[in-house]
């Protein structure tokens, strides 16, 4: 099954966020991804954990999963590069890049995403916006259309405490409310963007959502940019 | 490794108010509530209540309120618990303890002393 | 306030003995959140308290196998399977669940 949602977000504006992509297993959107560079896409590392046999492709310029538009494109993923310490049992850097066979072909609708490489924190409040296609409700019914939410950054404090994620927040990750509106599992290595710059890539560890004790987590970026660096070198 | 380091013990007079310190080291400072925690000479832990050192934000034990103000100064890394209108039965060892997934850190104790 | 009953207040006990101390709460302490903050802490003479268990069954690091945590709801356990002297103490059960978070009023583990 997909991993990870959107909920209480609304339907966004179609192709307003043309860094967005879609990671798919076999046909089927698996996780969100975020368009980093010409040829690479950044994601979750625990996405592809069960994705051993199958195969794995990135769409890019999509706003509809199933319905043809004119920018959409699926990209054959030439090499995946999860961060070497990513495990399965953790959180801690979740982080996945995904080579495309060819440069994206950038336009209105294609378009990488600056990504925040100074290493400080955002502030506790701010605004972020996170999109994906997730569930969108605990139903579970999967929007075909992407779907955003704003969320206010949570300070570091309060996603460390025992009744929240019980210190388990490292330096590396940062947190944003979770009060009804959410992602989640699904929306997995996509984007959260603070300010028209890419803070966050939303983790892929289960946990419950929409729960205002159990804030999202997201990793930071700027906490990587060696790493990127060096792989997108 | 982190540390918690308290101020020395403090004798005080029956009426008078002491402020006791709790220096943070090995890790960052903000990224935790910082809880305090009573003992009375021979008797049990009473919590007392915590801060989040990125806002000052307070929580109290509706039996400290009045009694326990918690501050924090970010730039030295040091809470702060100020205790007023001292009685003997404010005379205690009093400790400030990290919170993540329970109180693993704690600092060594302060003694107040509440004689005339 | 959850009221944290412990049980026994004293417990004397031999070397290489199995010790269990009781805990009960005045009230559920399943937070809302669906998690169980019950935590277990051993204070020596003139130290700081220290973690041993923490959400009822979970071992704090370098705390040795011989200590378990169970329970649930209202009651909750804490076993040592084989007492050595580095365990004597005042163990204390402790909820973080409810706001005041409280204490018991603490086992002293001892020497017969």
């Known amino acids: 099954p997909p991993r990870g949602r959107i909920l209480g977000g609304r339907e966004a504006e179609a192709h307003a966020r043309p860094y967005m992509a879609s990671v798919q297993l076999n046909g089927a959107h698996l996780c969100g991804g975020v368009l980093v560079a010409e040829q690479w896409v950044l994601s979750a590392a625990h996405c592809l954990e069960d994705a051993a046999d199958g195969k794995v492709q990135v769409l890019l310029g999509a706003h509809s999963l199933s319905q043809p538009e004119p920018s959409k494109r699926l990209y054959d993923v030439l090499r995946a590069v999860p961060h070497p310490d990513s495990q399965p049992d953790t959180i801690d850097h979740d982080l996945l890049l995904l080579q495309l066979s060819e440069k994206a072909t950038l336009g209105p609708a294609v378009r990488p995403l600056p990504w925040q490489r100074v290493d400080r924190d955002v502030a506790p409040g701010t605004l972020c916006d996170v999109a994906g296609w997730g569930i969108v409700n605990h139903a579970g019914r999967r929007p075909d259309s992407l779907q955003h939410v704003l969320l206010p950054v949570l300070d570091r404090a309060t996603c460390n405490r025992r009744t929240h994620h019980d210190g388990a927040i490292t330096e590396r990750l940062m947190c944003a409310e979770s009060n009804r509106r959410d992602s989640c599992k699904g929306d997995s290595g996509g984007p959260l963007v603070c300010g028209g710059v890419l803070e966050g890539v939303v983790t892929s560890g289960s946990r419950v959502c929409g729960n205002r004790k159990k804030p999202g987590i997201y990793t930071r970026v700027a906490s990587y940019a060696a790493w990127i660096d060096s792989v997108l070198a | 490794e982190v540390q918690l380091q308290q101020s020395g013990p403090e004798l005080v007079k029956p009426g008078a108010s002491v402020k006791i310190s709790c220096k943070a080291s090995g890790y960052t400072f903000t990224d935790h509530y910082m809880n305090w925690v009573k003992q009375s000479h021979g008797k049990s832990l009473e919590w007392i209540g915590d801060i989040n050192p990125n806002n000052g934000g307070t929580s109290y034990n509706q039996k400290f309120k009045g009694k326990a103000t918690l501050t924090v100064d970010k730039s030295s890394s040091t809470a702060y618990m100020e205790l007023r209108s001292l009685t003997s039965g404010d005379s205690a060892v009093y400790y400030c303890?990290?919170?993540?997934?329970?109180?693993?850190?704690w600092g060594q104790g302060t003694l107040v002393t509440v004689s005339a | 306030d959850v009221l944290m009953t412990q049980t026994p207040l004293s417990l004397p006990v031999s070397l290489g003995d199995q010790a269990s101390i009781s805990c009960r709460s005045s009230q559920s302490i399943v937070h809302s959140n669906g998690d169980t903050y019950l935590e277990w802490y051993l204070q020596k003479p003139g130290q700081s308290p220290k973690l041993l268990i923490y959400?009822?069954?979970n071992r704090f690091s370098g705390v040795p196998d011989r200590f378990s945590g169970s329970g649930s709801g209202t009651d909750f356990t804490l076993k040592i399977s084989r007492v050595e002297a580095e365990d004597l103490g005042v163990y204390y059960c402790?909820?973080?669940?409810?706001?005041?978070?409280?204490f018991g009023a603490g086992t002293k583990l001892e020497l017969k």
């Open positions: 402790f909820q973080g669940s409810h706001v005041p978070l409280t």
């Open positions: 303890t990290r919170e993540g997934a329970s109180f693993a850190f």
């Open positions: 959400k009822v069954s």
